[in-house]
């Protein structure tokens, strides 16, 4: 009776089990019943960094210089190439897709310390009572505007991303 | 494609004056913070000033405080930086840089020389 699952490291074609190709190598060929899984090693500047039937190895990461990126750590057949800023200068996300020379601030978020040369732009939230509703690098959060001082009443409650919206008091008649 | 185009250095003597200026294009001008950065001759960046889009907020280094003024006329789609009471010490290429501050958010800057 054909299988219906597989080991680990398999994989189930043709109603049988075949080998998956080993990291830093592609699938030429399914095996048969007479022969083995056919694999070839990744080419230059390409890997594959998982038990695989993978048909293509992928292209290494480009470590941009004209976004001011560059190789942190060489790929192989098995990893990617790591790419990383260049000096005093700031990756945009995890995978260091693009650099910044300093982070700004979401809404919401207000800039708790200015970058320098060495450091990135530290944020923090807004509590309560403060807001921030632009990106910013260098601005903090705001205080609330204070309606009573106004001698107005609060007509819509400010949140972290906005402020609260003052409005004449009811009048007794 | 964001165009920054920084105009105004030159070689003043110290206690001198100088107003650059940015024109930018390419890019909504009015929704923007701006940055006035510069780099010393061997030395890293240094951010000197910063203004929110709607000119009502600016940032100073405390090497440029009382000194520099930033300001910003978003009909003109234009940044300034005054410059006065010049220091050996500001000779640098001054570049204008928008938020996010990515390689494509700079101009090409303009060199201050400070010299007696």
């Known amino acids: 009776e054909p299988p219906t699952a597989c080991r680990e490291k398999q994989y189930l074609i043709n109603s049988q089990c075949c080998s998956l190709c080993q990291p830093g190598q592609k699938l030429v060929s399914d095996c048969t019943e007479f022969t083995e899984t056919e694999c070839l090693p990744c080419g230059e500047s390409e890997f594959l960094d998982t038990w695989n039937r993978e048909t293509h190895c992928h292209q290494h990461k480009y470590c941009d210089p004209n976004l001011g990126l560059r190789v942190q750590q060489k790929g192989t057949s098995e990893t990617d190439t790591i790419c990383t800023c260049e000096e005093g200068w700031h990756c945009t996300s995890e995978a260091c897709e693009s650099c910044v020379l300093h982070r700004s601030c979401s809404p919401g978020f207000g800039v708790k310390q200015i970058a320098t040369g060495v450091s990135d732009t530290i944020c923090e939230p807004c509590p309560v009572g403060f807001f921030s509703n632009v990106s910013s690098a260098f601005e903090k959060c705001h205080p609330w505007t204070s309606c009573e001082t106004k001698d107005l009443v609060v007509q819509q409650a400010g949140t972290n991303k906005t402020d609260v919206v003052c409005g004449p008091q009811d009048r007794l008649r | 494609e964001v165009q920054l185009l920084e105009s105004g250095g030159g070689l003043v003597q110290p206690g001198g004056s100088l107003r650059l200026s940015c024109a930018a294009s390419?890019?909504?001008?009015?929704?923007?913070e701006m940055w006035w950065v510069r780099q010393a001759p061997g030395k890293g960046l240094e951010r000197v000033s910063?203004?929110?889009?709607?000119?009502?907020?600016?940032y100073y280094a405390d090497s440029v405080k009382g000194r520099f003024t930033i300001s910003r006329d978003n009909s003109k789609n234009t940044l300034y930086l005054q410059m006065n009471s010049l220091r050996a010490e500001d000779t640098a290429v001054y570049y204008c840089?928008?938020?996010?501050?990515?390689?494509?958010?700079w101009g090409q800057g303009t060199l201050v020389t400070v010299s007696s």
């Open positions: 910063a203004i929110n889009p709607w000119g009502s907020h600016t």
């Open positions: 390419g890019f909504t001008f009015r929704d923007y």
């Open positions: 840089a928008k938020l996010p501050f990515t390689f494509d958010d």
